[in-house]
């Protein structure tokens, strides 16, 4: 606890002090006082540098004195033999004695008192910037007129902060301008304009005189402009050293004028005004700006329109133009939007065709569709080449955006039929010789595939089973082979309206209009073993002449078996209808005269016993196309016959082409259109 005064006595005083003693006293007086320590008695063993016994006076880290020996007062009116004056409020006194004393020494008596110090004069560093006032136990600072004392209670400054300028034009100067500005001051001025305007500061060189920089180039007094995260300055010296026109790109500007204690000059004066915030004329590729101007400022609106083949993509929506506004921050709205090349996207796939993965799907890119040759060809022309158009669609010169359509190639077997191995009445065949051949397993019969969705057969094949199971692509009709081939599922059976339905079909003698169509649920995939046969044309070129050769195929009765396991085929000539009439019916169910022969029937066979038979019904009588020798068309369908191994009757398909086309068109799916 600090005290104002006190007494310090050596151990046993006034008796002799003991040997080997070390004792210390910590003196503390109140804050704001110094200490006056004085000795009235001193009798300590003398030694060089007081090395044996001593009394030591320490102030902080400084030794103020070290005493030994005997002292007496020089002044008869004063008992003081030694004294110390320190301007601090703390002091330490340490007494030490060694192990022996040659004489009897009585030690010391000392007193301390708190004394006033003059902070204004006693220290090297002046505590006040302007006026210092001492009082007992302390001091206070004071300021000249128009100055005020800062919160540190030591420094004086002028009250030059807090001004906010909001007008679009104005003038600001340093305090007292053009008289010298106050020292030791920090003046802050704020310019706050409405958003969208930037503060532009203008100065004249002669309106600026601020204490120059030191030898290191640091401004002692300085003027600084701060606009957001941008700073202009610090500036100092005689004549303004910065740009005379400062565009801050901000609507808010802070002006900071900092002065030190020395070297006052006349200061500075500036003008400011608010400019609408400019937005840069940006280079946006592949677009045009409307209106076109040399300079765009706050609130200007432009329409940016993409050139043909370019679009602006925002989210999933593509547009050809957008609006952009010059914003208050000097940036354009929608600046992220760009005119990019139109992307036509991954081209749509097509059934039975393909399109190579394009290197690019952007405007101007070219893709090519191809059909799965040789089983499909491009029906609707156009060559299959599409380019990415400006509207974002893949476009063909002929078809426009319509996709190409790959349709099956008809009438072209992968392997031509050759009568290699002679079998009575026919040859072994491979399904690749007759890829249009369809197998019906109940009743055991045949049919001809004419496109992806339709099978042509004889009416008598399907009249008793309107949901026939059919197979394509297999030479053998063993269950094991059919299990691995393609089964066709019917959607609907269309029997020719001219076919007479009977109560007892076994007794039929009239096979006129023996033709039917089966619409399939799913399209058939074409390939080497499955491919349609063509239909006859309607021109006279497709009128058959006697002797014209045709191919028949099927799994019907042979000389060896009631049902063939592997496909059989034969080449037969067309014969006059009378040849069929002349053959005696093998197992007649009625009079020979009851059997009907019409122009809708073709008679063929009679050569080397080659003929169709039970189980071949519905299969095609395939004739070479007169206009394209590489193709076969279905001239007839196996219908009936008087006797196997003689002549057979075939439905004349040419007479039914209109009915076939009409039926298919009326019962097509959108997928086919």
């Amino acid at each position: 606890e600090p005290t104002m005064y006190g007494e310090i006595l050596s151990p046993n005083y006034p008796q002799a002090y003991p040997s080997e003693v070390e004792k210390s006293w910590d003196i503390e007086v109140p804050e704001g006082y110094g200490i006056h320590l004085y000795f009235t008695h001193l009798d300590i063993e003398l030694s060089e540098n007081c090395a044996y016994d001593s009394v030591q006076i320490i102030s902080g880290d400084t030794e103020e004195g070290r005493l030994c020996g005997q002292r007496s007062s020089n002044n008869p009116h004063s008992p003081i033999v030694e004294e110390f004056q320190v301007p601090y409020n703390k002091l330490q006194v340490i007494f030490k004695s060694d192990f022996s004393n040659e004489e009897r020494f009585t030690g010391f008596a000392a007193y301390y008192v708190a004394t006033d110090i003059n902070e204004c004069t006693d220290f090297v560093d002046v505590p006040c910037s302007h006026f210092c006032n001492n009082f007992i136990g302390g001091y206070f600072c004071s300021c000249p007129p128009e100055y005020f004392l800062h919160d540190d209670m030591k420094n004086c400054g002028v009250n030059c902060s807090g001004d906010v300028f909001t007008a679009l034009i104005g003038e600001i100067a340093s305090p007292n301008y053009p008289k010298p500005y106050p020292e030791n001051s920090r003046c802050e001025y704020q310019i706050r304009l409405e958003k969208g305007f930037q503060v532009v500061v203008t100065l004249r060189r002669e309106d600026f005189d601020v204490e120059a920089a030191d030898s290191a180039g640091n401004c002692l007094d300085s003027l600084v402009f701060v606009a957001g995260d941008r700073q202009f300055g610090p500036y100092c010296g005689h004549g303004f050293p910065g740009p005379l026109n400062i565009e801050t790109k901000s609507n808010a500007l802070d002006i900071i004028f900092q002065t030190d204690l020395t070297g006052q000059k006349k200061g500075w004066k500036l003008r400011y005004h608010g400019d609408p915030m400019p937005c840069p004329k940006e280079d946006t590729p592949n677009s045009v700006w409307e209106p076109a101007k040399a300079k765009y400022v706050f609130r200007d609106v432009v329409q940016i329109t993409c050139l043909d083949g370019f679009e602006v993509v925002e989210g999933r929506v593509g547009a050809t133009s957008f609006y952009s506004t010059c914003q208050s921050n000097g940036k354009w709205s929608n600046s992220k939007l760009k005119c990019q090349p139109v992307d036509c996207g991954i081209p749509e796939s097509i059934e039975n065709g393909k399109v190579e993965d394009p290197e690019s799907t952007l405007f101007g890119s070219v893709i090519r569709y191809t059909c799965e040759e040789p089983y499909y060809y491009m029906e609707n022309g156009g060559g299959g080449e599409y380019h990415c158009a400006g509207n974002g669609s893949w476009v063909n010169e002929v078809l426009g955006p319509e996709l190409p359509k790959c349709v099956p190639v008809c009438g072209v077997p992968r392997e031509p039929f050759e009568e290699k191995q002679r079998i009575i009445g026919g040859s072994d065949a491979d399904i690749k010789n007759f890829p249009w051949q369809v197998f019906f397993d109940n009743p055991w019969a045949g049919g001809a595939l004419i496109n992806e969705y339709w099978v042509l057969t004889a009416a008598h094949v399907v009249e008793g089973n309107r949901e026939p199971t059919m197979y394509v692509g297999s030479t053998s009709v063993q269950t094991s082979r059919l299990a691995k081939s393609k089964m066709l599922t019917p959607e609907h059976v269309f029997i020719h309206p001219g076919w007479k339905l009977l109560e007892v079909p076994e007794g039929r003698t009239n096979f006129d209009n023996d033709i039917a169509l089966v619409r399939l649920k799913d399209p058939v995939k074409m390939g080497p073993t499955v491919s349609p046969i063509c239909l006859p044309g309607t021109s006279s070129d497709y009128n058959l002449m006697d002797g014209d050769l045709g191919l028949i195929s099927g799994w019907g009765r042979t000389e060896k078996r009631d049902r063939a396991v592997r496909l059989k085929a034969a080449r037969l000539p067309v014969a006059p209808l009378r040849k069929c009439k002349e053959v005696k019916v093998e197992k007649p169910t009625a009079d020979a005269e009851a059997y009907v022969f019409t122009p809708n029937m073709i008679c063929a066979g009679g050569e080397k016993g080659m003929d169709s038979c039970k189980g071949d019904s519905g299969g095609a009588f395939a004739v070479q196309d007169p206009n394209d020798k590489t193709k076969f068309y279905a001239a007839g369908l196996v219908s009936w016959g008087p006797q196997c191994g003689t002549y057979g009757l075939y439905t004349r398909v040419k007479n039914y082409v209109d009915w076939i086309m009409k039926t298919m068109q009326e019962n097509s799916t959108p997928r086919e259109d």
Partner: antibody
């Protein structure tokens, strides 16, 4: 040349087991169904069991049901008959025969067009 | 199970004779019937399938007929090599069943 060769016959005690094999050659084995037929000494023919081309469908005579199992390994062109709980009345000459099955949903069967020479099974204590 | 009754169980005939063997099914079997010939110590051999179809390689003197429940095997002119036992087989439903056999002997 189409050929079927049976093996695995022999003498076995009642209650015992035997496995007959039939090796096929000269035709595409996995296109055909197969049957086992037996003939007791001095008696007529009795169909024992049959299996379709891929082994998914089997049939048995009532006299062997639950005791005999027919199977095939198409990779090895082989037919098998596993005979368990054998009885004296199972003593016979066992033939394997080839069956043809045509059609996809409606089946047309042509049974036993080719036969093997047979293998003898004797069940005796 | 379908029972197949074959008759006669045996017959004696001379070379050149016309021989007829009958098979009766206990229920209708359409035409799902085959005829087999077996000679002593040999495996059976198929003659006729689907009631009336002659197996490839079989002489044309053999013929089959019938449908439903009544079936016939006819040998139009018996030859020395035709002396054997003949069996019918129904395959209309599982279990397949053979007739009891007809033994054709030399008179």
């Amino acid at each position: 040349e189409v050929q079927l060769v049976e093996s695995g016959g022999g003498v076995v005690r009642p209650g015992g087991s035997l496995r007959l094999s039939c090796a096929a050659s000269g035709f595409t084995f996995d296109d055909y169904g197969m049957s086992w037929v037996r003939q007791a000494p001095g008696k007529g023919l009795e169909w024992v069991s049959g299996i379709n081309w891929e082994g998914g469908s089997t049939g048995y005579a009532d006299s062997v049901k639950g005791r005999f199992t027919i199977s095939r390994d198409n990779a090895k062109n082989s037919l098998y008959l596993q005979m368990n709980s054998l009885r004296a009345e199972d003593t016979a000459l066992y033939y394997c025969a080839r069956d043809e099955q045509l059609g996809g949903q409606t089946y047309y069967y042509y049974y036993m067009d080719v036969w093997g020479k047979g293998t003898t099974v004797t069940v005796s204590s | 199970d379908i029972q197949m009754t074959q008759s006669p169980s045996s017959l004696s005939a001379s070379v050149g004779d016309r021989v007829t063997i009958t098979c009766r099914a206990s229920q209708g079997i359409r035409n799902d019937l085959g005829w087999y010939q077996q000679k002593p110590g040999k495996a059976p051999k198929r003659l006729i399938y689907t009631a009336s179809n002659l197996q490839s390689g079989v002489p044309s003197r053999f013929s089959g007929s019938g449908s439903g429940t009544e079936f016939t095997l006819t040998i139009s002119s018996l030859q020395p090599e035709d002396f054997a036992t003949y069996y019918c087989l129904q395959y209309n439903q599982v279990p397949l069943t053979f007739g009891g056999g007809t033994k054709v002997e030399i008179k």
